[in-house]
C-alpha cells in the first residue's frame, strides 16, 4: 500500500467534510432561512460553540493540507537516505492527525449535546425555552411532541437535521484522522513505498 497516496486521499476527503461542516454550522444560525433569531439571540446555546465552523471545519483544514502535502515527490531526503524526509513527514502527520481528532471529537461532542438538549424555541406557554431539555433526548423518538415549539417554524426538524449532519460528518472526520494516525505510524516506521514504479489511486 502507498502511505502517501492514502494520506493525500484522506486529506482531500477532510477538506470536503470540513467545508460541509462549516456550511451545516452556518445554517444553524438561520432557522427556516431567517436572520431574526440570530439577531435576537434565540438560538440553541450549542450553536454558539462553533463546533462545525472551528472543530469540524477550520481545525480540520490544517491536518487536511498536511496530508495532501505528503504525496508530493520533492522530498530531498536526509543522511544519504532518499526516503528519510518523507518518513519524518509521515510521522509528523500523526501530530496533525491528532489535531484533527481533537477538532472532530469536539464537533461530535457538541453536536451530540445539541441533539440531546433540543432547540431553544417559543414553547406552548409563549416562553423561550429549551422545551425538550428534560426529556434526555427522548423527544427525538416522539415527533408528535415537536409541535410544542411554535417558533421558529420547523425548528426541531432544522436542529435535528443539522446537528445530526454535524455528528455524522464529525464522526467520519474522526475515523479518517484515526486511520491517518495508523497510516502515518506505519508509513514512518515501515518506510515510504511510493516510487515512480509504484503508483496507487486511493
Amino acid at each position: 500500500m502507498c502511505y502517501g497516496k492514502c494520506a493525500r486521499c484522506i486529506g482531500h476527503s477532510l477538506v470536503g467534510l470540513a467545508l460541509l461542516c462549516i456550511a451545516a454550522n452556518i445554517l444553524l444560525y438561520f432557522p427556516n432561512g431567517e436572520t431574526k433569531y440570530a439577531s435576537e439571540n434565540h438560538l440553541s446555546r450549542f450553536v454558539w460553540f462553533f463546533s462545525g465552523i472551528v472543530g469540524g471545519g477550520l481545525l480540520m483544514l490544517l491536518p487536511a493540507f498536511v496530508f495532501i502535502g505528503l504525496e508530493q515527490d520533492d522530498c530531498c531526503g536526509c543522511c544519504g537516505h532518499e526516503n528519510c524526509g518523507k518518513r519524518c513527514a509521515m510521522l509528523s502527520s500523526v501530530l496533525a492527525a491528532l489535531i484533527g481528532i481533537a477538532g472532530s471529537g469536539y464537533c461530535v461532542i457538541v453536536a451530540a449535546l445539541g441533539l440531546a438538549e433540543g432547540p431553544l424555541c417559543l414553547d406552548s406557554l409563549g416562553q423561550w425555552n429549551y422545551t425538550f431539555a428534560s426529556t434526555e433526548g427522548q423527544y427525538l423518538l416522539d415527533t408528535s411532541t415537536w409541535s410544542e415549539c411554535t417558533e421558529p417554524k420547523h425548528i426541531v426538524e432544522w436542529n435535528v437535521s443539522l446537528f445530526s449532519i454535524l455528528l455524522a460528518l464529525g464522526g467520519i472526520e474522526f475515523i479518517l484522522c484515526l486511520i491517518q494516525v495508523i497510516n502515518g505510524v506505519l508509513g514512518g516506521i515501515c518506510g515510504f513505498c511510493c516510487s515512480h514504479q509504484q503508483q496507487y489511486d486511493c
Epitope: 417559543l122 406552548s124 406557554l125 409563549g126 416562553q127 423561550w128 409541535s147 411554535t150 417558533e151 421558529p152 417554524k153
Partner: antibody, heavy 120, light 106 residues
Framework: EVQLVQSGAEVKKPGASVKVSCKAS????????VKWVRQAPGQGLEWMGW????????IYAADFKGRVTMTTDTSTSTAYMELRSLRSDDTAVYYC?????????????WGQGTLVTVSS | EIVLTQSPATLSLSPGERATLSCRAN?????INWYQQKPGQAPRLLIY???NLASGIPARFSGSGSGRDFTLTISSLEPEDFAVYYC?????????FGGGTKVEIK
C-alpha cells in the same frame, strides 16, 4: 392607538360553525401572540388556546382540540377563531387578546368581545 | 391542571376602605396576573408577574405572593373599583383563571 376589533354578534343553530375575526391595529401584529378566551353568561373566563401570529402555529386547550381552528392573515393583521359542532353551552362572549411572549406573558389588550348565541 | 381558588367570592366594602383579595393555587406557580372586569366590558390587566403594575393602573393597586398564595390589595377603594377581579396563571398548560371575586359597594 393599540386595539383589537372583533366581528359582530352571531346567532347559530346547534351543530353549526362560527368564525370570529379579530383585527389588530396600532402595533406590529406578528410581534405578539393572540389568545382566545370565552366567557359564558354570568360565568368566569375560559382559555381556548392561542396562535403564534408570526409562524401561524396554534396551541389549543385540550377541551377544544378537534373542534377549534385558529388562523391568522398577516396581510390584514387579522386573527380568526372557528368553532365547529356548536352546542348550547358554547353560548358565550368570545374575546381575542394580545399577549407579549416572555416570562410573564400578560394580556394587555383585549378585543371588545363577540357574543355567540347557540339556539335552536 | 392548576386550579385557582379566589376568596372571598364577594367582598362588600365602602369607598375608602382597604380591599384584600386572595388567590390560592393547588400547586406551586411562578407568577400570577390580575384582571378587573366591569359589567358589559372586557377584562382589563391590572397586575402582571405577581407584583408589577400594568400601564395606566393607579398605584392604589398592588400585588404580592409566591408559590401557592397570592394577594391583590386595593389600598383605598374608589367608586370605579367596584367590579369583578380575576387572577390568572400560565406557569403550565392549560392557562387557567380563578373563579373571580366580586367587590361590591356595602
Amino acid at each position: 392607538e393599540v386595539q383589537l376589533v372583533q366581528s359582530g354578534a352571531e346567532v347559530k343553530k346547534p351543530g353549526a360553525s362560527v368564525k370570529v375575526s379579530c383585527k389588530a391595529s396600532g402595533y406590529t401584529f406578528t410581534n405578539y401572540g393572540v389568545k382566545w378566551v370565552r366567557q359564558a353568561p354570568g360565568q368566569g373566563l375560559e382559555w381556548m388556546g392561542w396562535i403564534n401570529t408570526y409562524t401561524g402555529n396554534p396551541i389549543y386547550a385540550a377541551d377544544f382540540k378537534g373542534r377549534v381552528t385558529m388562523t391568522t392573515d398577516t396581510s390584514t393583521s387579522t386573527a380568526y377563531m372557528e368553532l365547529r359542532s356548536l352546542r348550547s353551552d358554547d353560548t358565550a362572549v368570545y374575546y381575542c387578546v394580545r399577549f407579549q411572549y416572555g416570562d410573564y406573558r400578560y394580556f394587555d389588550v383585549w378585543g371588545q368581545g363577540t357574543l355567540v348565541t347557540v339556539s335552536s | 391542571e392548576i386550579v385557582l381558588t379566589q376568596s372571598p367570592a364577594t367582598l362588600s366594602l365602602s369607598p375608602g376602605e382597604r380591599a384584600t383579595l386572595s388567590c390560592r393555587a393547588n400547586s406551586g406557580i411562578s407568577f400570577i396576573n390580575w384582571y378587573q372586569q366591569k359589567p358589559g366590558q372586557a377584562p382589563r390587566l391590572l397586575i402582571y408577574g405577581t407584583a408589577n403594575l400594568a400601564s395606566g393602573i393607579p398605584a392604589r393597586f398592588s400585588g404580592s405572593g409566591s408559590g401557592r398564595d397570592f394577594t391583590l390589595t386595593i389600598s383605598s377603594l374608589e367608586p370605579e373599583d367596584f367590579a369583578v377581579y380575576y387572577c390568572q396563571q400560565w406557569s403550565s398548560n392549560p392557562l387557567t383563571f380563578g373563579g373571580g371575586t366580586k367587590v361590591e359597594i356595602k
